[in-house]
Interface confidence: low
């Protein structure tokens, strides 16, 4: 028996369902009684889901997995993972045994889009050219860790005094806080771009300082 999986990682959004594709070519006269199908975590060998002795043995992994029982006889051994979480990320091995056996691994990459950044300015009043200001760009609930870029009104990179911190919450999603310390010009726009490297999703925030008032 030969097992085939997709070579590219499966990308799944947090809280959506993902299908980890795995297939084999059954011989003529193949019966499900002959099939032993095991899905496991590649690294830890933890059992995820199994089909043995002619029946679906069910999920052994947080009760969020399912096979496609009607398609098994055609050689479709794909696994459905429901309500994907950050901790589901990793490599899954599909192990198929009929008379002989074969296995292959498929990678699951979890992602979550970052929220539109909120911008704060400190100090936020009585600003004059030459003042040192702190601009904070905050974006929430993304995964994996973001790339953060600062640009001026002309779209040129601001590489000055930037400090970026990324903190994971209980669900493993990241909250990003990037702080730019800059000396004000006569007026200007300061833009923050938070990029999700997996989704290639860009979230933009900007603050424009034109004397008074500021616009966000």
């Amino acid at each position: 028996v030969e097992v085939q999986v997709s070579e590219d990682p499966v990308v799944a959004l947090v809280d959506t369902d993902a299908t980890l594709r795995c297939s084999f070519s059954p011989e003529p006269g193949f019966s499900l009684r002959q099939l032993n199908l095991i899905w496991q975590l590649t690294d830890t060998k933890q059992l995820v889901h199994s089909f043995t002795e002619g029946r679906d043995q069910g999920s052994a992994y947080a009760n969020r997995t399912a096979l496609f029982p009607d398609l098994l006889v055609q050689g479709n051994a794909s696994l459905r993972l429901q309500r994907v979480r950050v901790t589901d990320e990793g490599s899954y091995t599909c192990f198929v045994s009929i008379q002989d056996f074969d296995s292959a691994a498929v990678s699951l990459q979890v992602a979550a889009p970052y929220s539109k950044p909120s911008m704060t300015l400190e100090p936020n009043k009585d600003l004059r050219p030459g003042d040192m200001v702190t601009i904070t760009c905050s974006s929430y609930q993304g995964y994996p860790e973001a790339e953060v870029f600062w640009k001026d009104g002309q779209g040129l990179p601001l590489t000055g005094n930037v400090t970026t911190s990324q903190m994971a919450n209980e669900r493993g999603l990241f909250d990003v806080h990037s702080v730019l310390r800059v000396v004000l010009g006569a007026n200007g726009t300061y833009s923050c771009l938070v990029r999700n490297p997996v989704l290639q999703q860009d979230a933009h925030g900007s603050v424009t300082i034109t004397g008074q008032p500021m616009t966000f």
């Epitope: 975590l41 690294d43 830890t44 933890q46 947080a62 979480r85 950050v86 901790t87 589901d88 990793g90 994971a168 919450n169 209980e170 669900r171 493993g172």
Partner: antibody, heavy 121, light 107 residues
Amino acid sequence: QVQLVESGAEVKKPGSSVKVSCKASGGTFSSYAISWVRQAPGQGLEWMGRIIPILGIANYAQKFQGRVTITADKSTSTAYMELSSLRSEDTAVYYCANGGDSSSWYTFDYWGQGTLITVSS
Amino acid sequence: DIQMTQSPSTLSASVGDRVTITCRASQSIDNWLAWYQQKPGKAPKLLIYKASSLQSGVPSRFSGSGSGTEFTLTISSLQPDDFASYYCQQYDSNPLTFGGGTKVEIK
């Protein structure tokens, strides 16, 4: 069934550090979170922080930020809690706790037996 | 941080009594609340999660209710084994916080 076994009681001097271990068995260590909760004599429960080994990420309660470090060694299924700059009010029983699988990061089905740390000069 | 306030701090009751313990959150935590029982010298034991879901193996005389900021743990008929301390815990946001505890003692 998850089992959590902690290291033994210790007496420490003020200003020193202590490192408590918590060895897990009976589950998939890397995919669940280990929290540390302490209880001063005759007092209530206080959550200090947690580590999620599969992510390699630790979160701490603000009160302990800078003084506590929680780590995990996946190869030995052991979590560690190190508390520095000890003072007398850190005298407490320290528990490691977890929810048994990756879906229970927030409530605690399983607890270690507790480690009494006494801080005294 | 979300403050959890339990009342009463001590409760005297007899075997067979119906006992109610209240837990109040300083802000809404939806139903992200757990209840624990702790006996002297022992680690806590999870009784209720998600405000009203009974943990496997916990006797049905224990029940939880409430959402938002007001929650209750009820023991329908107090048994000798139930004399202990009880704690609520919110898990809506970091840091996880516990109530101050309620000691249920023999009247």
